[in-house]
Interface confidence: medium
Amino acid sequence: LSTCKTIDMELVKRKRIEAIRGQILSKLRLASPPSQGEVPPGPLPEAVLALYNSTRDRVAGESADPEPEPEADYYAKEVTRVLMVDRNNAIYEKTKDISHSIYMFFNTSDIREAVPEPPLLSRAELRLQRLKSSVEQHVELYQKYSNNSWRYLGNRLLTPTDTPEWLSFDVTAVVRQWLNQGDGIQGFRFSAHCSCDSKDNKLHVEINGISPKRRGDLGTIHDMNRPFLLLMATPLERAQHLHSSRHRRALDTNYCFSSTEKNCCVRQLYIDFRKDLGWKWIHEPKGYHANFCLGPCPYIWSLDTQYSKVLALYNQHNPGASASPCCVPQALEPLPIVYYVGRKPKVEQLSNMIVRSCKCS
Amino acid sequence: LSTCKTIDMELVKRKRIEAIRGQILSKLRLASPPSQGEVPPGPLPEAVLALYNSTRDRVAGESADPEPEPEADYYAKEVTRVLMVDRNNAIYEKTKDISHSIYMFFNTSDIREAVPEPPLLSRAELRLQRLKSSVEQHVELYQKYSNNSWRYLGNRLLTPTDTPEWLSFDVTAVVRQWLNQGDGIQGFRFSAHCSCDSKDNKLHVEINGISPKRRGDLGTIHDMNRPFLLLMATPLERAQHLHSSRHRRALDTNYCFSSTEKNCCVRQLYIDFRKDLGWKWIHEPKGYHANFCLGPCPYIWSLDTQYSKVLALYNQHNPGASASPCCVPQALEPLPIVYYVGRKPKVEQLSNMIVRSCKCS
């Protein structure tokens, strides 16, 4: 790899290994490796191994950091609002005497006007304005599923409030699903949480522009405060570039380990505790794939080069518009270890030890 | 600010401003600023402003990126398991004929053995091993609150499975609360989701080592598979360092804008679209606090300097054990804008535009 001057890859690896030596001791608050004089002979106790495996399983099940943003997330999102179907629509007829829930229906053709293709949708929020209330209530949100069934989406504990407040629910997956189906009326149900042993199943929360009992004055409520969907989507014409232009690659192990990428990428580095650090005191694991980030992130002068080709480079080389972009870790994962303090085995988890992907920042 | 050579702060700002010029156009997929020839005179339409405000409200309500990790998260966590109180304990007596729920009780003195102080707890997971099942069921987890009441914690949709599988619930806040109370028996309830209009409230899920109906063979179930709490905590002796040693500061606007920090920090930069970029085409906002990251992140050679003072520096200057640590954005926020394309006003959201804090990475 070369930037202005040739990079000494071996020196970089050595510096990374030495940094890890300090990092592990520092994370354990140890001034030096613990003495191994009292460590009992033989394998680790079964209970300790089970605990180590439990910790490792947790790590496998959930990555410590959010996934790197997909390419489309770099680009601007057009924001639109879709108001719920008017309360005078016949579709609300059969819902008006239900005390445990209120209903909000949306016409998917209105949604499709704003978001013609399901993958263009970046985020959808259901926004409801809750009126002032003196009671605490646990509420749930459901999605209309088939003719007469509802699918649970989420819940919220609503505490008393002196002023109207907006509630927001992330319904991205639901709206994307609607867009994958045909045009029609789809809806949400906002319900009291009914516990198996609870008696009071009435919804005490009032939502602006809607209410369990149909009122004559609903038509007068200002449209702005009626429940609506806030949609964020990549405009169609911008999305067509995404397919045609060179993709921003995820600078992760899948791509970087199998390519000859000269620019910023994650580089392979396995650390063997014995061989690389001369340590015998970490009993599990024997080593780990630490990896590291390396490669240039060119600064792009945009003043005299305002044309598509140069602008497309921003996404890859300087998405954060830094004055001096730098190749740094993006997704990191923790590392569980087993070591002894005197005769006592310990299982500890070290955060942010494994570099999974890099980015220019 | 100086590193080896003096930094020309004005040049850095200029480069950041120019990078932002390219970044905004690039995010909007524009080769050049849009023509303003057809823009109607007068203020923005009310509906467009309402939409812009809705988007801005969303941004205010939830930061786009996770909060920077607290200092304690840098250090290793000791992992321990606390098994639930044995099913033969009399406390289970009054729960055995309830078909909608199963109960798991824990002795807080066992938990306190592992975590003597509430703030030391980093994470607590309730782990249950679900036996194979051919039914789908929506389940809920509750925390024992006062003598006869239960507080809702979370839910899960369990799909059919051919093999036993572990379920994990994050119960950190609950366990921390228990640690803040006296010693005693505390518990969880694992229940069927009872909808306001549902008839079948029976829990069909079976959990290893526990079951709605008490069985004679429960004692034989291997302890490893009985429900347990997986605890991750900072050991007491390590925590005492946290109070005594120099804290790792959050390199955010609160700290950096009011200090003379020479090392990596977020630096103030307001961009006025008209003055700084010569742009009249962005109608809202008029400008924004872009900010930027600047300052050295010294590499620490740990080979011949294994002593506490140097190790403490890792946390601040090179927590990721990089071969060449770099001052980069940590928390970023989006920016909603209003601009015209021809006669049509558009509200768009640009991701990762405002730098709230920095880190050495």
Epitope: N107, R112, G182, D183, Q240 | -
Partner: antibody, heavy 120, light 111 residues
């Protein structure tokens, strides 16, 4: 605005056919599209629809699994690939522009149609 | 058998008013889904008359109007003319099928 179908003709049962529809006079890449057929002397039957970018397609139960609808926005062309044809697929096939972008909410412009005859 | 039911034929004299009906169910018309009406003159392709239940397509004379009550939709033609002799189809999205459906069609004869 113009929609011109082509590719119809005589085909044996079990055979395949690919219909095309050339679109002009509107922004094809922003429009949902549909195919509708009409058997001789019978009523209209909706066959399939596609969204503007082609990421979602919808089919009538009578053709599901035998028919694939696709589009090439660069060429402003819509396609209907028909396999395992049966005699009951004999009809005039119309290409139509969707009222909204799914093609499932009605059609506002129609082509003149192309005749497909399935017979041995 | 169509999901949307129409009378197979109707007739009327010039100048008269005729109403063509289309009966559906809660999974289509009654579900609040947009209904369209199409006219097909003999030997030609269908043409959109009405969309979204009661909106006239461009170029359609105001003699044509649409309405809906519950699951019943209607197309009304006032001041019937000879050139209105055609087949008329209703069409709507059906959520139980996740498809678009047409009525069987009504053949209107102008006497």
């Amino acid at each position: 605005l113009q929609l011109v179908e082509s590719g119809g003709g005589l085909v044996q049962p079990g055979g395949s056919l690919r219909l095309s529809c050339a679109a002009s006079g509107f922004t094809f890449s922003r429009s949902g599209m549909a195919w509708v057929r009409q058997a001789p002397g019978k009523g209209l039957e909706w066959v399939s629809a596609i969204t503007p970018g082609g990421t979602a397609t919808y089919y009538a139960n009578s053709v599901k699994g035998r028919v694939t609808m696709s589009r090439d926005n660069a060429k402003n062309t819509l396609y209907l690939q028909m396999n395992s044809l049966k005699s009951e697929d004999t009809a005039v096939y119309y290409c139509a522009k969707g009222l909204v972008s799914s093609g499932l909410n009605g059609m506002d412009y129609w082509g003149k149609g192309t005749l497909v005859t399935v017979s041995s | 058998q169509s999901v949307l039911t129409q009378l197979s034929s109707m007739s009327g004299s010039p100048g008269q008013t005729v109403t063509i009906t289309c009966t559906g169910s809660s999974s289509n018309i009654g579900g609040g889904y947009y209904l369209s009406w199409y006219q097909q003159l003999p030997g030609t392709a269908p043409k959109l008359l009405i969309y979204n239940t009661n909106n006239r397509a461009s170029g359609v004379p105001n003699r044509f109007s649409g309405s809906k009550t519950g699951s019943l939709a209607s197309l009304t033609i006032t001041g019937l003319q000879a050139e209105d002799e055609a087949d008329y189809y209703c069409g709507c999205y059906d959520d139980s099928l996740n498809t678009y459906v047409f009525g069987g069609g009504t053949k209107l004869t102008v006497l």
